[in-house]
Interface confidence: low
């Protein structure tokens, strides 16, 4: 039931006085002040929420055209996300070159390890099996990542092979034709 004596219920936003002190009684003044503050707080929050929803909608709409603006990161099915990268851990085994070609077919590369956190994550996640990563070297040449950048000795690589893999302790190397599981990596996909 609408109570015409209840100012709190009667006041609409357009009827709020510019100065709440203009109300005659103290009780009405306090109520009007609270209503005024509450109204503007609700309006403020509504504007912020609406703005965020609109911004996110626009961002998501642009995801495919401008991936860099997308906020919500995701990885393809059967890929694992870690620190803005997606990793694929194979079940199959291949030689180093075929492993890289598999990664290439997925718009990825054999994993490039860029931090100790990433290395520890890969070592933890891959389990006990050896997995190829994207490091290789030509005879007498320094180790290089798949994209051609030189390896900066972030971790030791044991062995005398030309291609690197992760084992249960860290990194080692072997001939490219030996068969192992592999890890692909690529930048995360934004959706």
């Amino acid at each position: 039931m609408h109570d015409s004596n209840n100012v709190e219920k009667d006041i609409t936003p357009s009827e709020l006085p510019a100065n709440p002190g203009c109300l005659h009684s103290k009780e009405h003044s306090i109520k009007a002040t609270l209503i005024w503050r509450l109204f503007f707080l609700i309006m403020f929050l509504t504007i912020i929420v609406c703005g965020m929803v609109a911004a996110l909608s626009a961002i998501r709409a642009n995801c495919h055209q401008e991936p860099s603006v997308c906020l919500q990161a995701a990885c393809p099915e059967s890929w694992i996300g870690f620190q803005r990268k997606c990793f694929y851990f194979s079940d199959d085994t291949k030689n180093w070159t075929s492993s890289q070609r598999f990664c290439d077919s997925q718009d990825a590369d054999l994993a490039q390890v860029e931090s100790f956190q990433e290395l520890n994550f890969l070592l933890r996640y891959k389990g006990p099996s050896d997995h190829w990563i994207g490091l290789s070297r030509e005879q007498g040449q320094p180790w290089k990542w798949i994209n051609g950048t030189e390896w900066t000795r972030q971790f030791p690589i044991l062995g005398a092979g030309e291609c690197a893999y992760l084992n249960d302790k860290g990194a080692s190397s072997a001939r490219h034709y030996t068969e192992r599981k592999w890890i692909c990596s690529k930048s995360d996909i934004h959706v």
């Epitope: 070159t97 070609r101 054999l110 798949i146 490219h176």
Partner: antibody, heavy 123, light 108 residues
Framework: QVTLKESGPTLVKPTQTLTLTCTFS??????????VGWIRQPPGKALEWLAL???????RYSPSLKSRLTITKDTSKNQVVLTMTNMDPVDTATYYC???????????????WGQGTLVTVSS | ETTLTQSPGTLSLSPGERVSLSCRAS???????LAWYQQRPGQAPSLLIY???SRAAGVPDRFSGSGSGTDFALTISRVEPEDFAVYYC?????????FGQGTRLEIK
Amino acid sequence: QVTLKESGPTLVKPTQTLTLTCTFSGFSLSTSGVGVGWIRQPPGKALEWLALIYWDDDKRYSPSLKSRLTITKDTSKNQVVLTMTNMDPVDTATYYCAHRLDSSGRGGYFDYWGQGTLVTVSS
Amino acid sequence: ETTLTQSPGTLSLSPGERVSLSCRASQNVYSNFLAWYQQRPGQAPSLLIYGASSRAAGVPDRFSGSGSGTDFALTISRVEPEDFAVYYCQQYGTSPITFGQGTRLEIK
């Protein structure tokens, strides 16, 4: 010494299927890293990559022609076969096969080429 | 797909001159996986340069390759009569493999 030689019909009618064979020597298509590719060149025009097959039977095709191409290998005969369906006069070109050593996992350059075979598509 | 644009289309010069041919990619060529080929009239292409700057076996040292990213060049320090031919660049860093449209080197 690596050699490659293309063979197949010199004249094909529109809508027919072209079958080309590349017979090679001096390398084995069972050796890790080895691939054989097909490239074509219309008269007076640029080179266009068509297809590629690797020692492990991995196959790659040009996206624009993928639906029309099939590449296969016969390791024992040292042969690679390319078939191209629904031939059209615009497919008139010299067709080359070439050897490729993929040591990077991202493919490689073509270091040995066949002499090429001119295929004319006309009714 | 990576589009390769070669310039100029045709180049007229005399034997003994130095020449640079340009190959520009529409996007970075992955790990500078770019090759140059020479094609003489009526012959198949032959590999000159791979990896942007490495000379293939048997290629005279007057041929050199340079560049990275999107801009590459093939330089012939002193053009010999047998060098008059068409030159193609090719990228093999990303699928599909693509070739440039070629630069024809002709005698002035």
